[in-house]
Amino acid sequence: QRVPKEGQTFFQKPESCPSVPEGSLKLDLGIINANQRVPLSRNIERRSTSPWNYTVTWDPNRYPSEVVQAQCRHLGCVNAQGKEDIFMNSVPIQQETLVLRRKHQGCSVSFQLEKLLVTVGCTCVKPLIHHVH
Amino acid sequence: QRVPKEGQTFFQKPESCPSVPEGSLKLDLGIINANQRVPLSRNIERRSTSPWNYTVTWDPNRYPSEVVQAQCRHLGCVNAQGKEDIFMNSVPIQQETLVLRRKHQGCSVSFQLEKLLVTVGCTCVKPLIHHVH
C-alpha cells in the first residue's frame, strides 16, 4: 500500500505551508464530470475480428461498485469468412484505473485509492513468433 | 460535479452512525496495489490490424499526472499484405476511469475524484453499413 514516487509529492502541501496531518487527506464529495460516458458501442465487442465477452464484477465497498472486465473469445482472429484464423492472435487491451475503496471500523469510515487492472477489449495482432519447421 | 446515484449511498455512513460533516471525507494516504502494472505490451499498438499511436497528456494537479490516450492510425484495417482495407473499420476502445484532482486555495489543499474518458487502443470491426452500388 505504498505511494508511488510521483504520488509522494502530489499529496504534499507546498513547502511554505504547514504540513498535512500524517496519514489522511480531505476528499471533497462529488465527482467532476460524473455524467461523462463511453459512447454507445454499437456492439463492437461482437463485430470485432477479435471479439470479446464481458464479465461484471461487483464490490459494494468499491467505487464504482460495478467494474466490467473483457475476455477475448478466440485464440486467433475471425477472418472474412467468419472462421477463426489461428495465424493471427486476439490479445487483450488493458488499462490501469483508479477506484475508491471504502473501509469502515464501526462508525469510522475512511477511503483509499486502489489501482485496478481492467481488460477493456481485444485487438487482432500479427504474431511475433512463427514456428520454424 | 454531482454525485451519481450509486455514489450517494456509497459515501454515506451506516444509518445508525452520526452523519458525515457535509462536503468532505477522509482519504487515507497510500494506494492499494500501487505496483500493479499493465504487462509489457510487445508493441501490440504497432502489430495490430487496427494500429494506434499514443499521446501523453500531463497535468500536475491530477493523479496520475500522466494519462496516455490512443488514436487509431487508420480508418480501415491493415490486411495480410500490409495494405489498408477500407471495407473494415478501425475503431477506438474507450474506458471510463477515475483520477484524483488536487485543488488548492493558499495552504488549504483538498482532493476530488474526476471521471475521465480514456481511449485505450483500437480494434478492427466489420462495418455496420455497406455501400450499395
Epitope: 475476455q71 481488460t119 504474431p127 | -
Partner: nanobody, 123 residues
C-alpha cells in the same frame, strides 16, 4: 503477475483417466490464454493445447484431440486437463502455462509457467 500451481498428477493404470488442475493467483486470470504442455523423460517439451480467455475457443495439438479435454473456470481462476484412455507414452511432467498471446504460448514462449505435476501411466 500470475502464479500457476498444478495438481492432480499421480500413478494411473493404462486405459484409466485423470483430471489435472492448475490454480492461478492474480486478479486478471480471464485476460490470459492458458494451456498445457508436457515433457516426457529425455524428450522436448510438447504442446498439448490452449484455451482462450473466455473459454470459447480451444486449440489442441492434433495428436491429443480425442483423448484430452481442456477447460477453464474463470470464477475459480482454474484451468483443467481431462485425460482419458491413458497410455504408457503419456507418462510425463505436465505443465500449465499462461500468456496474453496464443502465438507465444503455442511455441513454448509463455510468460508464466507452473512447476509441473508428474503423471505416470503403468501398463
Amino acid at each position: 503477475e500470475v502464479q500457476l500451481v498444478e495438481s492432480g498428477g499421480g500413478l494411473v493404470q493404462a486405459g484409466g483417466s485423470l483430471r489435472l488442475s492448475c490454480a492461478a493467483s492474480g486478479r486478471t486470470f480471464s485476460s490470459y490464454v492458458v494451456g498445457w504442455f508436457r515433457q516426457a523423460p529425455g524428450k522436448e517439451r510438447e504442446f498439448i493445447g490452449a484455451i482462450s480467455g473466455s473459454g470459447d475457443s480451444i486449440y489442441y495439438a492434433v495428436s491429443e484431440k480425442d483423448r484430452f479435454t481442456i477447460s477453464r473456470d474463470n470464477g475459480k481462476n482454474t484451468l483443467y486437463l481431462q485425460m482419458s484412455s491413458l497410455k504408457a507414452e503419456d507418462t510425463a511432467v505436465y505443465y500449465c502455462t499462461a500468456d496474453q498471446e496464443f502465438g507465444y504460448l503455442r511455441f513454448g514462449r509463455s510468460e508464466y509457467w507452473g512447476q509441473g505435476t508428474q503423471v505416470t501411466v503403468s501398463s
